[in-house]
């Protein structure tokens, strides 16, 4: 006989089973492809000088053998002689030491003896209706199944749940889902309606996230701003890692979670583009501005809770950079140009109001003026800082004004608005007697000392009504008294205060007249 | 999406033959065993032949010796050649891919629409 052929001829050892407790047993045959089968047996005693015969009785009644010598599984193809189509017997005799051994026999149709397989390559998990589904492609040559599926977290054992009977080109499977831990799945299939059937080994783990991606414990810092009018945001605790089930250490697709960065820019709300997303790793560079900060946490199944950050401003002001010259078209501000082809955002709102109420203007594209510059110009009819108050300016510069970080601060400022001049005049001017040749003369704060960095300095200007003398004093900005000496007796005086700004110089109080009178001796 | 498409039915004379063919597309056609079963009017749909593999091939005892079924995996067709045709194989004749017992119906599970092949006395 060929010995790829089941040989019809009586085996070469005599036909005596021992009856012992050792031989063959769990025989196992399978259509392996199209054409091609496979039986598998244990063997339990010693395995030194054994022989296994596979035997084989058709439906006709007429048997035969294939000898697989000390192996314990054997092929063979549909054209070895057994029958695919009909019923077949099989058992394994095993010939040792003198004595036959027998298997249990198995009776079956070859060619629907399938080994089933578990689900392989790609298995697709989605959520439904607060489940979990798990789909595949059903194994070639494999449709109609039972599925069961077995699941644990990092603290708890193996949980076994089926999946129910599956007959099409592709499976699913309802698994439960958790909220807030991970859990490790596997799959395995076996025949539909075949009892008998053994299960298929279990598929490699499917690593699923829990519904809940965990909420980001993670805290900033924001840097001081820099020369280049921008300050960084750094990271100072990581986001907590989700626990695992053993399964799924090292490599477990499936189950990342990524955290996103989500800043939104307050200041500036006339700009194109108010929030931008980055990765959480990308620590980005920002301006002075006021910004909210949230990090998102997603897995596969979507977004779960944000923590949100307050960035306050960057309040420290440059009052020297700024000029502003008032004329009869109206205002201009000058400042040091960045450079070409820059976009400013100017923004103003008064001071000691919500930043809500926060007013801006963005230029057109601008390259500095040959003093090195950048300019901004309004009208006095379009109403910007009109009213007689004090505004916060801050001017930010972008090459980019589309890119949310690609903003920096050119520089944070205080402005008095509408008629300064006017509007910043001392009163409540009173002059009181200090000595024989002198008085302390004191005045209300101007409304230019609420503007921090506007109120240069005061004035105060004596006039001699007899030789029509004058002589002015000034006065730190933050003093509101000042003492004129050298005064004469019975001499008419009149006092005066202006308040003056850098730029602008102010107007005078009304005249206030005194005198010192003539002490007369005893 | 599975697709089974059968062609080659018509009208023949008693004792004439006809090549029936059925090409199938979404799955991999090679590794799946195929059936024909045809059903004449007012009837059930019954057996009529299997290829299991490429080469292992079974039939109803009324086509034995008639019929031959056979495929040609490069193509992903299956055929059906029948010769001496009688008024009593006059039915629509369908092909269908198998997932167990292949002499029932229940064993398959994609069916294509069908040909209608009629043989006139």
């Known amino acids: 006989c060929r010995t790829s052929e089941c040989c019809f001829q009586d085996p070469p050892y005599p036909d005596a089973d021992s009856g012992s407790a050792s031989g063959p047993r769990d025989l196992r045959c399978y259509r392996i492809s199209s054409d091609r089968y496979e039986c598998s047996w244990q063997y339990e005693g010693p395995t030194a000088g054994v022989s296994h015969f596979l035997r084989c009785c058709l439906s006709s009644g007429r048997c035969c053998y294939f000898a697989a010598g000390s192996a314990t599984r054997l092929q063979f193809s549909d054209q070895a002689g057994v029958s695919v189509l009909y019923t077949v017997t099989l058992w394994v005799e095993s010939w040792a030491r003198n004595q036959t051994e027998k298997s249990p026999e198995v009776t079956l149709q070859l060619y629907n003896s399938v080994k089933y397989e578990p689900p392989l390559g790609d298995i697709k998990v989605s959520k439904l209706a607060g489940q979990l589904r798990m789909e595949w492609e059903t194994p070639d040559n494999q449709v109609g199944a039972e599925v069961q599926f077995r699941h644990r977290t990092p603290s708890s054992p193996w949980k076994l749940g089926d999946c129910g009977p599956q007959d099409d080109d592709t499976e699913s499977c309802l698994c439960p889902l958790e909220m807030n831990v991970a859990q490790e799945f596997q799959l395995r299939r076996r025949q539909l309606g075949s009892q008998g059937s053994s299960w298929s080994k279990w598929s490699s783990p499917v690593c699923v996230p829990p519904e809940n991606p965990p909420q980001p414990q993670v805290r900033f810092s924001v840097e001081q701003l820099g020369q280049d009018g921008r300050r960084r945001l750094t990271l100072k605790e990581q986001p907590t890692q989700l626990e695992l089930p053993e399964g799924c250490q090292g490599l477990a697709p499936g189950t990342e979670v990524t955290y996103r960065l989500q800043l939104h820019m307050l200041s500036c709300p006339c700009k194109a583009k108010a929030t931008r997303t980055l990765h959480l790793g990308k620590m980005p560079y920002l301006s002075g501005a006021a910004y909210n900060v949230a990090v998102i946490s997603s897995n596969q199944f979507g977004p779960g809770l944000n923590q949100t950050w307050h960035i306050p401003a960057d309040t420290h002001t440059e009052p020297v950079a700024l000029n502003i010259s008032v004329g009869t078209n109206g205002t201009t501000m000058y400042w040091p140009a960045r450079a070409q082809s820059m976009t400013y955002c100017i923004e103003w709102q008064p001071v000691g109001q919500d930043g809500g109420l926060a007013t801006c203007s963005l230029t057109a594209p601008q390259d500095p003026d040959p003093a090195g510059m950048a300019t901004y110009s309004w009208s006095r009819e379009s109403g910007a800082m009109g009213q007689e108050k004090c505004y916060y300016i801050t001017i930010f510069a972008s090459a980019h004004p589309e890119k949310l970080t690609l903003w920096s601060t050119v520089l944070s400022t205080y402005h008095f608005g509408g008629n300064a001049s006017a509007a910043g005049t001392p009163h409540h001017v009173s002059v009181k007697n200090h000595s024989l040749d002198s008085v302390s003369v004191d005045w209300a704060p101007s409304l230019l000392s609420t503007c921090p960095g506007v109120l240069k300095e005061y004035v105060v200007r004596c006039r001699d009504e007899d030789s029509k003398q004058v002589s002015e004093h000034p006065v730190q900005p933050t003093e509101t008294q000042v003492t004129l000496s050298g005064l004469r007796a019975g001499v008419a005086y009149t006092v005066q205060v202006r308040a003056d700004t850098a730029w602008l110089r102010g107007v005078w109080s009304q005249p206030q007249r005194f005198s010192i009178e003539v002490q007369v001796s005893d | 999406e599975v697709q089974l498409v059968e062609s080659g039915g018509g009208l023949v004379t008693a004792g004439g033959s006809l090549r029936l063919s059925c090409a199938a597309s979404?799955?991999?056609?090679?590794?799946?065993?195929m059936g024909w079963f045809r059903q004449a009017p007012g009837k059930e749909r019954e057996f009529v032949a299997v290829?299991?593999?490429?080469?292992?091939?079974d039939y109803a005892d009324s086509v034995k010796g008639r019929f031959i079924i056979f495929r040609d995996n490069a193509k992903n067709t299956l055929y059906l050649q029948m010769n001496g045709l009688k008024p009593d194989d006059t039915a629509v004749y369908y092909c269908?891919?198998?997932?167990?017992?292949?002499?029932?119906?229940?064993?398959?599970?994609?069916w294509g629409q069908g040909t209608q092949v009629t043989v006139s006395s």
């Open positions: 979404g799955f991999r056609f090679s590794v799946y065993d």
């Open positions: 269908a891919r198998r997932v167990g017992t292949y002499e029932t119906v229940l064993g398959y599970d994609k």
């Open positions: 290829i299991v593999g490429s080469r292992t091939t």
